[in-house]
C-alpha cells in the first residue's frame, strides 16, 4: 500500500516583503525521501524544479530556490510540491511575495549560498501525473 504523502511547506528568507533589487530564497520543505521539489507560481502557470534536495533534519528534507535580484514582476503567489517516486504530493499553502520600492540600492551583500535551480518552464498537461519524471536536472542558473 502506498503511503500518504504529507503536504509540503513553503517559506521565504529573509521574508515575504522584499525591496526591489534584493535577494529572496524560497524554501520548500517535505518528508524524508523527496527526490524533486517544484516551486510553482500563480496556479502552475510557471514552475521550477530542482533535484538538489538535502535532509535538513531526520524528519525533514528541503530545497532552496533563489532569486538574486528581485523585480516587480517577481511579486505574486508561490507554492511548493514535491515528487517522491512514484507520486507527486499535494501543493503547499500559497505564500505571497511582495516587492517594495527601495529607498537606496540593493540591500546588504548575500549571506547565504542558496542552491539554485534551472530555468522557468511551462508545464505540460501531465506535469502533476503521478508518474511524470522530474522535468529537469540541476543547472547553475537562477529563478525567473
Amino acid at each position: 500500500q502506498e503511503e500518504d504523502l504529507p503536504r509540503p511547506s513553503i517559506s521565504a528568507e529573509p521574508g515575504t516583503v522584499i525591496p526591489l533589487g534584493s535577494h529572496v530564497t524560497f524554501v520548500c520543505r517535505g518528508p524524508v525521501g523527496v527526490q524533486t521539489f517544484r516551486l510553482e507560481r500563480d496556479s502552475r502557470s510557471t514552475y521550477n524544479d530542482t533535484e538538489d534536495v538535502s535532509q535538513a533534519s531526520p524528519s525533514e528534507s528541503e530545497a532552496r530556490f533563489r532569486i538574486d535580484s528581485v523585480r516587480e514582476g517577481n511579486a505574486g503567489l508561490y507554492r511548493c510540491i514535491y515528487y517522491k517516486p512514484p507520486k507527486w504530493s499535494e501543493q503547499s499553502d500559497y505564500l505571497e511575495l511582495l516587492v517594495k520600492e527601495s529607498s537606496g540600492g540593493p540591500d546588504s551583500p548575500d549571506t547565504e549560498p542558496g542552491s539554485s535551480a534551472g530555468p522557468t518552464q511551462r508545464p505540460s498537461d501531465n506535469s502533476h501525473n503521478e508518474h511524470a519524471p522530474a522535468s529537469q536536472g540541476l543547472k547553475a542558473e537562477h529563478l525567473y
Epitope: 527526490q35 533535484e51 538538489d52 534536495v53 538535502s54 535532509q55 528534507s61 529537469q136
Partner: antibody, heavy 116, light 110 residues
C-alpha cells in the same frame, strides 16, 4: 518484489572499454536516481557516481573521466572508459531512495576483472 | 571534497555486548547520513537512514544518532549474526558537494 540486477561483468584486458548494465524489476527505473558503487576484493565500498531521473550526473572526484553513467527508459549503464588493474572489483547498481535515504536498494553485484 | 572518516577500523566484542562506531564528516552534512551492514559475498543492507530512522525490518538494537559532522551507530545486545562490516554514507549528491562512503568498520563477535 522490487529488485535491481547488474550484468556485463567479465574479464577484459587493460584499456578495453567495458559497459555494465543495470535493470530493474517491480518498479519503473526511469522514475528514480540510480547509483553505481564498487568494491575491490577485500576492500571497502567506493561510490562512483549517480544519474538522476533528469539524466544529469554526479561523480566522485576520483571517478570523473574514468567512468560514464547513462540511462535509457529501462536501463542504467556504467561505462569504464579505459580500465586498469585497479578497476578490478565487484560493481553494484543501487536505487537512490531520495533525500536522507541514499542508495538503499542494491543488486547482487557483477564482477569485473582487468588483467592482461 | 567531502571525506567520511570511520572509527574504529575493526572491533571485537562478546555476544550481548555493545559496539559503537563513529563517522566523522569533513564538513557539515546536516542529516544526510545512512548506515549499512555488509556480510561477505552479499550487497550492503541499509540499517539506518537520515541519521536516526530505522530501515524496514531492522531490529531496534541498531541506533543511529548525531548531526552536522559527528555521527554514531550503536549496536546493543550483540548477536553472532551482527558480525559484518559496517559503512556510513553521506546521502547528499547535489550542488554543494557529493557524498560517498566511509572506510568501513569490521565487527567481530567473540
Amino acid at each position: 518484489e522490487q529488485s535491481v540486477e547488474e550484468s556485463g561483468g567479465r574479464l577484459v584486458t587493460p584499456g578495453t572499454p567495458l559497459t555494465l548494465t543495470c535493470t530493474a524489476s517491480g518498479f519503473t527505473i526511469s522514475d528514480y536516481h540510480m547509483c553505481w558503487v564498487r568494491q575491490a576484493p577485500g576492500k571497502g565500498l567506493e561510490w562512483i557516481g549517480l544519474i538522476r531521473a533528469s539524466h544529469s550526473t554526479a561523480y566522485a572526484s576520483w571517478a570523473n573521466g574514468r567512468f560514464t553513467i547513462s540511462r535509457t527508459s529501462t536501463t542504467v549503464d556504467l561505462k569504464i572508459t579505459s580500465p586498469t588493474s585497479e578497476d578490478t572489483a565487484t560493481y553494484f547498481c543501487a536505487r537512490y531512495g531520495g533525500s536522507g535515504i541514499g542508495c538503499n536498494l542494491w543488486g547482487p553485484g557483477t564482477l569485473v576483472t582487468i588483467s592482461s | 571534497e567531502l571525506v567520511l572518516t570511520q572509527t574504529p577500523a575493526s572491533v571485537s566484542e562478546p555476544v550481548g555486548g555493545t559496539v559503537t562506531i563513529k563517522c566523522q564528516a569533513s564538513q557539515s552534512i546536516d542529516s544526510n547520513l545512512a548506515w549499512y551492514q555488509q556480510k561477505p559475498g552479499q550487497p550492503p543492507k541499509q540499517l539506518i537512514y537520515a541519521v536516526s530512522n530505522l530501515a524496514s525490518g531492522v531490529p531496534s538494537r541498531f541506533k543511529g544518532s548525531g548531526s552536522g559532522t559527528e555521527f554514531t551507530l550503536t549496536i546493543s545486545d550483540l548477536e553472532c549474526a551482527d558480525a559484518a562490516s559496517y559503512y556510513c554514507e553521506c546521502t547528499y549528491y547535489g550542488n554543494s558537494y557529493v557524498g560517498g562512503f566511509g572506510g568501513g568498520t569490521e565487527v567481530e563477535i567473540k
